[in-house]
Interface confidence: low
Amino acid sequence: AITEAREEAKPYPLFPGPFPGSLQTDHTPLLSLPHASGYQPALMFSPTQPGRPHTGNVAIPQVTSVESKPLPPLAFKHTVGHIILSEHKGVKFNCSISVPNIYQDTTISWWKDGKELLGAHHAITQFYPDDEVTAIIASFSITSVQRSDNGSYICKMKINNEEIVSDPIYIEVQGLPHFTKQPESMNVTRNTAFNLTCQAVGPPEPVNIFWVQNSSRVNEQPEKSPSVLTVPGLTEMAVFSCEAHNDKGLTVSKGVQINIKAIPSPPTEVSIRNSTAHSILISWVPGFDGYSPFRNCSIQVKEADPLSNGSVMIFNTSALPHLYQIKQLQALANYSIGVSCMNEIGWSAVSPWILASTTEGAPSVAPLNVTVFLNESSDNVDIRWMKPPTKQQDGELVGYRISHVWQSAGISKELLEEVGQNGSRARISVQVHNATCTVRIAAVTRGGVGPFSDPVKIFIPAHGWVDYAPSSTPAPGNADPVLII
């Protein structure tokens, strides 16, 4: 139903001649100007106080009539000042003015809260002409009011560059409480107090709040909105909501789950991404975080050799990116690896342990007792050495790498030779005469090339020299042995 808000009864006629409110059935308006249609009407209202001062603008025309009498000031008639209605109802209200016929092209516009209403509003202007004046009624209707229709509405009319403004019509839409702040899901520490907030507004005010925990009311008496519920602490998950009540009824907020923070579940799927002689790259899938973000993780590494002392190495790392390179491991060794992660509550249990192995390492010691001498008859250099003491982790010896550098005036030339693992001697042909040959030897395993021995130098004379003597790895303290033959 549409409730119309008409002008209040006045002791004087609203307009000269019959028209609303004393509209006769045979009296139809000469002109009806519908604006864009879209809204609809209906409602209750409280009229403004009779006799209150008129606050709208008044235009005083400077024109005089034929009898030279000044025209009366132009102003919108008093109308209802405050309309209260329920949400989704319709409303229709109007403003009216009597304009002397000497004025042409008068238009009335509607404004809400300082902005002109254009487009999708149901506004109609009707004209009722008489001998000297034309009564104009501008009506505005809304079919189904919403909270957003709350506000102050006015009419404006322009005449002779003068703007005439009506008194405001305040529209107050009442409905069920509307939440402006609802409780939010939280993750809380066990037995620790926390707050939930619920705020709802009318109109009508006041709005009262009841709190509900797991379908049971928390507070016997309602609290005025806004309400902050301080929960002293929980030991298990709970669901909270709030009910907002006003004279129109009740609205229930969304239910929010309050989770209790706990230690995380252990990581799963620990896997080996890559192994080298001294490092292992692992990855893992984090377990459930216990409703609290992971802070960091701990990688625990034990030697899997039954004869080891069972000590555990611990490596701490950030929780992301679920990847860690374990370093400083022994070559060709077996390890058990487990991962544990922590949040603010504590550490998870360790993941299932996995076995991982490092690969062979390069030798850690150079060959010993390197001796070099010139075999002039065959124009070769003979090299001898002793096999280095290899550790198990260094892997199986596969050979040796010999570096020989030939240096003479302005020339330096390095050559590399590979020798099989069984030998402990090698022969290299002389590359340059009247030059120094510097020899270094390294052991080689599948894990790589070990360190080179200290350099041993021998001088290779020009052709024709007879005497020669061996050159060998220097005793400690001799920095640069050179034996000239």
Epitope: N195, E205, P206, V207, E223, P226, V228, T230
Partner: antibody, heavy 124, light 107 residues
């Protein structure tokens, strides 16, 4: 325990401004409205306004809006009130006050906690 | 805004005497609170939500009322009760208002 510690006395000239402070401790400052109350010598209590430090929202008593400006610094848990264009009528003790904040806001509980008051004297 | 009128403005009572002071609101209020203030000190919350006694307040005090009419009663006056008492209301929206106070003196 909850404490509201206000700044010391102020002597100011008419037309000048003054900014007084209220440092809060013992509770989560940003989650409780802070109110300011005026008491002229030998007179009653007059509510000036309140601020919600969490978002800076303010409400003022109509006639004091513009003359009093409420602000809050969450980092130091301190509420401030600036009074401008002071007149002799503004000579008073100014209190900061807040509610209890347990289950209900201060609307239900009233002002449970009060600062010790700051004396502002306006004198030529 | 809602205006609170306290009466009487000043009153005196002998030890052991029952004392009642009232607070009348210009329109219905949502919540009514009472504060006690002694000279040179901050006000103390004394009664909240019409009738609930603040922590540490003697059971000699009681509060009652609804709508626009509220009262504070002391069943048996004691010397330490001499102070000024203010009522305070809070409707659905600010401003909060206080009454002018009732000064209670010991006879």
């Amino acid at each position: 325990q909850v404490q509201l510690q206000q700044s010391g006395p102020e002597l100011v000239k008419p037309g000048a401004s003054v900014k007084i402070s209220c440092k809060a401790s013992g509770y989560e400052f940003s989650r409780s409205w802070m109110n300011w109350v005026k008491q002229r010598p030998g007179k009653g209590l007059e509510w000036i306004g309140r601020i919600y430090p969490g978002d800076g929202d303010t409400n003022y008593k109509g006639k004091l809006k513009g003359q009093a400006t409420l602000t809050a610094d969450k980092s130091s848990s301190t509420a401030y009130m600036q009074l401008s264009s002071l007149t002799f009528e503004d000579s008073a003790v100014y209190f900061c006050a807040r509610g209890g904040g347990y289950y209900y806001d201060s609307r239900y509980e009233g002002f449970v906690y009060w600062g010790q008051g700051t004396v502002v004297t306006v004198s030529a | 805004q809602i205006v609170l009128t306290q009466s009487p403005a000043i009153m005196s009572a002998s030890p052991g005497e029952e004392v009642t002071m009232t607070c009348s609101a210009s329109s219905s209020v949502s919540y009514m609170h009472w504060y006690q203030q002694k000279s040179g000190t901050s006000p103390k919350r004394w009664i909240y939500d019409t009738s609930k006694l603040a922590s540490g307040v003697s059971g000699r005090f009681s509060g009652s009322g609804s709508g626009t009419s509220y009262s504070l009663t002391i069943s048996s006056m004691e010397a330490e009760d001499a102070a000024t008492y203010y009522c305070q209301q809070w409707s659905s929206n600010p401003p909060i208002t206080f009454g002018a106070g009732t000064k209670l003196e010991l006879k």
